[in-house]
Amino acid sequence: IFKKEQAMCLEKIQRANELMGFNDSSPGCPGMWDNITCWKPAHVGEMVLVSCPELFRIFNPDQVWETETIGESDFGDSNSLDLSDMGVVSRNCTEDGWSEPFPHYFDACGFDEYESET
C-alpha cells in the first residue's frame, strides 16, 4: 500500500512543480513523501496542513474525525483544513527547509512513522 501511495505522491509532486513553476533551484520547500503522507511543494513562509492519512483509520477504528479527501486538485483543498480540527498535522516551509511535523503524527494521529514502515 505504501509503495503505491509513495508512487502516487511523487507523480502529484511532479505535476505540482510544473503548475507552480518549481525546479531544483527554486527557493522554497520541495514536495515530499515522508513515509506517512504526501506534502505539496511550498514557498518559504507557507504553512502546509494535511489530515491524518485515511489508511490509519483501519489501524485506529476509534478515530472519528472527518479526514480531508483528495478532490480534483492533487493535494485536495488544504485551505479547508484548520489546525483547530483534530487529526491535522502541519509543517512550515522555512529558509532551512521543512520544519518537523506539528503535532507529531503519534500525538495527532495515534501512529508512528515506524508503523508505516512495516
Epitope: 485506529n60 476509534d62 478515530q63 472519528v64 474525525w65 489546525l83 483547530s84 480540527d85 483534530m86 491535522v88 506539528f102 503535532p103 507529531h104 500525538d107 495527532a108 495515534g110 501512529f111 508512528d112 515506524y114 508503523e115 514502515e117 512495516t118
Partner: antibody
Framework: QVQLQQSGPGLVKPSQTLSLTCAIS??????????WNWIRQSPSRGLEWLGR?????????HYAVSVKSRITINPDTSKSQFSLQLNSVTPEDTAVYYC?????????????WGQGTLVTVSS | DIQMTQSPSSLSASVGDRITITCRAS??????LNWYQQKPGKAPKLLIY???SLQSGIPSRFSGSGSGTDFTLTINSLQPEDFATYFC?????????FGPGTKVDIK
C-alpha cells in the same frame, strides 16, 4: 481488567537515583496500541507528566524537557513491566509517582493508573 | 510547553447543584483535552476524553465541551461521591501538561 502495580523505595537520598517499577497485568508492555507513562504529583508542581515508552516495531521514549537529562524509562518484556529511573535527585523531586497506561481513541489519554508511590528525597 | 489554567481553584457546592469548571490552554489544542477526577490518597480517574466524550462507566451527569483554548467540565446534579479535585490535561503535544486542579467541596 488492566491493573498496574507499583513498587520501589519510598525514601531516596539527595544525589542518588530514584528507581520505581510498574508491573502490568491484563495488558502487555509490548502492546502496539498502548503507551506506558510516568507522572508525578507534588503540592508545589501539581501533576507533572514525566515521560512514556511504547513499542511500534521498535521501542521509543518521549521525556519531559524538565527531567530529560536525568530520566530513563525502560520496558522489561520478560516481566511485562516498565521502570522509572531518575538520577541526581534533590528534595524538589519529592512527590507521589504514578505509572499509567496511555490509550488512543481520537487522542491519547491515561485510562489506567498505578496506586501511586510517595517518594521522599531526604538525607 | 503548553500551559493549562483552571478556574475556579476551589468551589463549594451542595448535593443536587449543577457546577461548571473551566480550563484554558495557552495555545489552541483543538479538542485534545481530557478531564480527570482525583480523590484524596487515590490516583486520578479519567472522566472525559477528546473534550466531550464520556469514558466508559462514567455517569452521564458528567459532560465536557469546548475546542481550541477554552473548555468546560459540567456536573449536573452533584452527588456526594463527586466531591473531589478535577484536573484537565492536554495531549496535543508533549509534555502533556495538566491544569492545577479545581477542588469541589461541600457547602
Amino acid at each position: 481488567q488492566v491493573q498496574l502495580q507499583q513498587s520501589g523505595p519510598g525514601l531516596v537520598k539527595p544525589s542518588q537515583t530514584l528507581s520505581l517499577t510498574c508491573a502490568i497485568s491484563g495488558d502487555s508492555v509490548s502492546s502496539n496500541s498502548a503507551t506506558w507513562n510516568w507522572i508525578r504529583q507534588s503540592p508545589s508542581r501539581g501533576l507533572e507528566w514525566l515521560g512514556r515508552t511504547y513499542y511500534r516495531s521498535k521501542w521509543s521514549n518521549h521525556y519531559a524537557v524538565s527531567v530529560k537529562s536525568r530520566i530513563t524509562i525502560n520496558p522489561d518484556t520478560s516481566k511485562s513491566q516498565f521502570s522509572l529511573q531518575l538520577n541526581s535527585v534533590t528534595p524538589e523531586d519529592t512527590a507521589v509517582y504514578y505509572c499509567a497506561r496511555g490509550t488512543w481513541k481520537q487522542l491519547w489519554f491515561l485510562d489506567h493508573w498505578g496506586q501511586g508511590t510517595l517518594v521522599t528525597v531526604s538525607s | 510547553d503548553i500551559q493549562m489554567t483552571q478556574s475556579p481553584s476551589s468551589l463549594s457546592a451542595s448535593v443536587g447543584d449543577r457546577i461548571t469548571i473551566t480550563c484554558r490552554a495557552s495555545q489552541s489544542i483543538s479538542r485534545y483535552l481530557n478531564w480527570y477526577q482525583q480523590k484524596p490518597g487515590k490516583a486520578p480517574k479519567l472522566l472525559i476524553y477528546a473534550a466531550s466524550s464520556l469514558q466508559s462507566g462514567i455517569p452521564s451527569r458528567f459532560s465536557g465541551s469546548g475546542s481550541g483554548t477554552d473548555f468546560t467540565l459540567t456536573i449536573n446534579s452533584l452527588q456526594p461521591e463527586d466531591f473531589a479535585t478535577y484536573f484537565c490535561q492536554q495531549s496535543y503535544s508533549p509534555p502533556f501538561t495538566f491544569g492545577p486542579g479545581t477542588k469541589v467541596d461541600i457547602k
